[in-house]
């Protein structure tokens, strides 16, 4: 379904009161940092493309961000605009296309060779009581529900994937590392270009679950190289 294709753990989308996208179908997916996109107009064809009004980036498609169509334009009139490619100027992560993020005012690639997505180095560090102060929602897991005997739940800090409970992996989120869900069939995944290289994505996705591999979605073969959508598919 469209929902399962769109749903990803790169970063989570906001509840309707915050995200302002209650009427949109689908979930969020983002390889672009800082951004979440419920629905948006990504799946409209060019022929029936209409400027999509928005209040914030979450309301736009994966390859879009929310801004005034004219430079220095009225902030009250904002639409979803096409994301900016590598080396283009940016003012926030949302403006950069998937696989890039905004650093020092320029969209830069999220790929850096020195980082491996699933860091399995042997760090001999014991976990003590570690209580984060983020709270406020009825269903929550904080960064820090780690104890000696428990495996980290979603949102718990981690050093390696073995620190996380079953079905979770240890991945980067912003500048920290937390347990995130392993991807299920149909979910968007990140295909890294070189074997053994995991991108330094500011919002890093987990790998595909058992029996699944990250492959180009069949109906996206015709798309341009940069915009091919990879999803977790059965071997």
């Amino acid at each position: 379904t469209l929902n399962s294709v769109l749903n990803s753990n790169a970063i989570k989308n906001l509840p309707p009161p915050l995200g302002g996208a209650a009427g949109h179908p689908g979930s969020a997916v983002s390889a672009a940092p800082g951004i979440l996109y419920p629905g948006g107009n990504k799946y409209q064809t060019i022929d029936n493309y209409q400027p999509y009004p928005c209040a914030e980036d979450e309301e736009c498609g994966t390859d879009e961000y929310c801004a005034s169509p004219t430079r220095g334009g009225d902030a009250g009139v904002q639409i979803c605009l096409a994301c900016r490619k590598r080396r283009k100027r940016c003012m926030r992560h949302a403006m950069c296309c998937p696989g890039n993020y905004c650093k020092n005012g320029i969209c830069v690639s999220s790929d850096q060779n020195h980082f491996r997505g699933e860091i399995e180095e042997t760090i001999t560090e014991s976990f003590g009581n570690d209580h984060s102060t983020l709270d406020g929602y009825s269903r929550r897991t904080t960064l820090s529900s780690k104890m000696y005997h428990t495996k980290g739940q979603e949102g718990s800090v981690c050093l390696r994937s073995s620190d996380c409970a079953s079905g979770l992996c240890c991945a980067r989120h912003f500048w920290s590392k937390i347990c995130k869900p392993v991807l299920k069939e149909g979910q968007v995944c990140t295909k890294h270009r070189r074997k053994g290289s995991h991108g330094l994505e500011i919002f890093q996705r987990c790998y595909c679950g058992e029996g699944l591999s990250c492959r180009i979605q069949k109906d996206h073969h015709q798309a341009s190289n940069s915009s091919r959508l990879h999803t977790c598919q059965r071997h």
Epitope: N13, L14, E56, R92, I119, I123, L134, G136, W175
Partner: antibody, heavy 125, light 107 residues
Amino acid sequence: QVQLVESGGGVVQPGRSLRLSCAASGFTFSSYGMHWVRQAPGKGLEWVAVILYDGSDNYYADSVKGRFTISRDNSKNTLYLQMNSLRAEDTAVYYCAREGIAVAGDYYYYGMDVWGQGTTVTVSS
Amino acid sequence: EIVLTQSPGTLSVSPGERATLSCRASQSVSSSYLAWYQQKPGQAPRLLIYGASGRATGIPDRFSGSGSGTDFILTISRLEPEDFAVYYCQQYGSSFTFGGGTKVEIK
């Protein structure tokens, strides 16, 4: 308990250097992004720099880029800020802060959830 | 960079009254990454609200946050003596920026 303690502040002449430290305890330091934030006397908060959990990536405010260096030693649970070519406008209380991420239902949220008490840097001739 | 403008600069309110603090961004900000902090004289800032509306641990329910896009609000429903302080909003877009702060003082 979760605690951050800054040290290394003091009075220094313009153009000179200073290194601040932030000792972390009570949490898994090596999994968290860490920040430096400063506050000039009588002014608001200004973000200075952030470093990735493993020290392999960092990011600076334009005002300090090329002069300040953020680093960390995860084996010592310590964050550092090396400040070179100091200017009068760098005079401030410097805080280290921990990046926090919460998961609520299907959503991730962000905030600087733990702060140190601050260390004062005065740049004066 | 994204500029956050807080208003008013100073808010004079009597204890027990409601206080409404505004934070306006120069461009759209993801609600996920909009936070509010409280700072008292001589103390470090304290996280109050994250994700525009989520209360941090130990924060009383008289504090609430709302808003999306470019306009965000921090509301203190009934001011207690200990609430008189400076309040900052903060975002993470491409860089981390704080608003200039709103001082809530006793009327």
